[in-house]
């Protein structure tokens, strides 16, 4: 069964700057990745970035840089200033649309006791929805 993992890290240099990394553990080809915060995409969450392997990347503030790390993982850096800045308990969700397997989504947040610059290792987060 495919799995999605989510890792959230607060940058040591900018305490309100976050890096989100997500990956897909499955055999299908990824057709689209959607990163959101505040809950799953389409269920109250707000889209931060959409990554398409062929057509490029779209991102919305406070997202600063979204990119592919590998063919099955992505990273997203969030700006740390302004009213729309994330906070320590913000939930981030990644939805991977995979062909032909369907859509798989998982969410994660900053580990409660993590020091700035540290994070839990990327482990598969609970899969919230498989369409």
């Amino acid at each position: 069964t495919p799995e999605v993992w989510v890792q959230v890290r607060m940058e040591a240099t900018e305490l309100s700057s976050f890096t989100i990394r997500c990956g897909f553990l499955g055999s299908g080809s990824i057709s689209l990745v959607t990163v959101s915060w505040g809950g799953p995409n389409g269920a109250g969450g707000t889209t931060l970035a959409v990554l398409h392997p062929e057509r490029g990347i779209r991102q919305w503030a406070p997202a600063r840089q979204a990119r592919w790390e590998t063919q099955s993982s992505i990273s997203l850096i969030l700006e740390g200033s302004g009213a729309s800045s994330p906070c320590a308990n913000t939930t981030f969700c990644c939805k991977f649309a995979s062909f032909p397997e369907g859509s798989w989504e998982a969410c994660g947040s900053l580990p409660p006791s993590s020091d700035p610059g540290l994070s839990a290792p990327p482990t598969p987060a609970p899969i919230l929805r498989a369409d």
């Epitope: 889209t47 062929e54 991102q59 062909f99």
Partner: antibody, heavy 117, light 107 residues
Framework: EVQLVESGGGLVQPGGSLRLSCAAS????????MHWVRQAPGKGLEWVSD???????YYLGSVKGRFTISRENAKNSLYLQMNSLRAGDTAVYYC????FGYGMDVWGQGTTVTVSS | DIQMTQSPSSLSASVGDRVTITCRAS??????LGWYQQKPGKAPKRLIY???SLQSGVPSRFSGSGSGTEFTLTISSLQPEDFATYYC?????????FGGGTKVEIK
């Protein structure tokens, strides 16, 4: 109600210029890619250009360097500046919305561009 | 560029007929394909997205199937308002490309 309304079409001589506009309403404009698609008289549909939410642009090869797509998110507006127009650019031009990666879903009614001497 | 070859280019059918239109892509496009209906003097309207998902508000007599390079639009029981031209569109890669269209006429 989601709505796209094009304007700016008309008759222009070969080599001339025209600027098309599209006014969007009923949705959060900045969240969507916006496209121009055209249809020559009696012919099929042809994609022309796409602009991403932050201004990333893509063009059909035959219009690259002549057409410029742009958007003003604050005004919910999309534009197509067409220069060095040719007879082959004669068509109805449609403004179209796309939730990026999911395909075009909402179309305007179209505006007619005629390039003729 | 990805070429989309649609067939037939036209067909004649009667009300109640089952109609099938095919679109072939020159390379695999997963399921990044939509089907559109256009009536004379009107803008196209999306019927199907993601190759097989029915657009909200579209009658269930329309269905889409296929993936990779071969796709089908089926109208299970043709109605008078279905006489129109139908197009497929691939949105996997730039330039986005449409099929040449299929005109469905009254027999």
């Amino acid at each position: 109600e989601v709505q796209l309304v094009e304007s700016g079409g008309g008759l222009v001589q070969p080599g001339g210029s025209l600027r098309l506009s599209c006014a969007a309403s009923g949705f959060t404009f900045r969240n969507y890619d916006m496209h121009w698609v055209r249809q020559a008289p009696g012919k099929g549909l042809e994609w022309v250009s796409d602009i991403g939410n932050s201004g990333e642009t893509y063009y059909l090869g035959s219009v690259k360097g002549r057409f410029t797509i742009s958007r003003e998110n604050a005004k919910n507006s999309l534009y197509l500046q067409m220069n060095s127009l040719r007879a082959g650019d004669t068509a109805v031009y449609y403004c179209v919305r796309e939730e990026f990666g999911y395909g075009m879903d909402v179309w305007g009614q179209g505006t007619t561009v005629t390039v003729s001497s | 560029d990805i070429q989309m070859t649609q067939s037939p280019s036209s067909l004649s059918a009667s009300v109640g007929d089952r109609v099938t239109i095919t679109c072939r892509a020159s390379q695999g496009i997963r399921n990044d394909l939509g089907w559109y209906q256009q009536k004379p003097g009107k803008a196209p309207k999306r019927l199907i997205y993601a190759a097989s998902s029915l657009q909200s508000g579209v009658p269930s007599r329309f269905s889409g199937s296929g993936s990779g390079t071969e796709f089908t639009l089926t109208i299970s029981s043709l109605q008078p308002e279905d006489f129109a031209t139908y197009y497929c569109l691939q949105h996997l890669n730039y330039p986005l490309t449409f099929g040449g269209g299929t005109k469905v006429e009254i027999k």
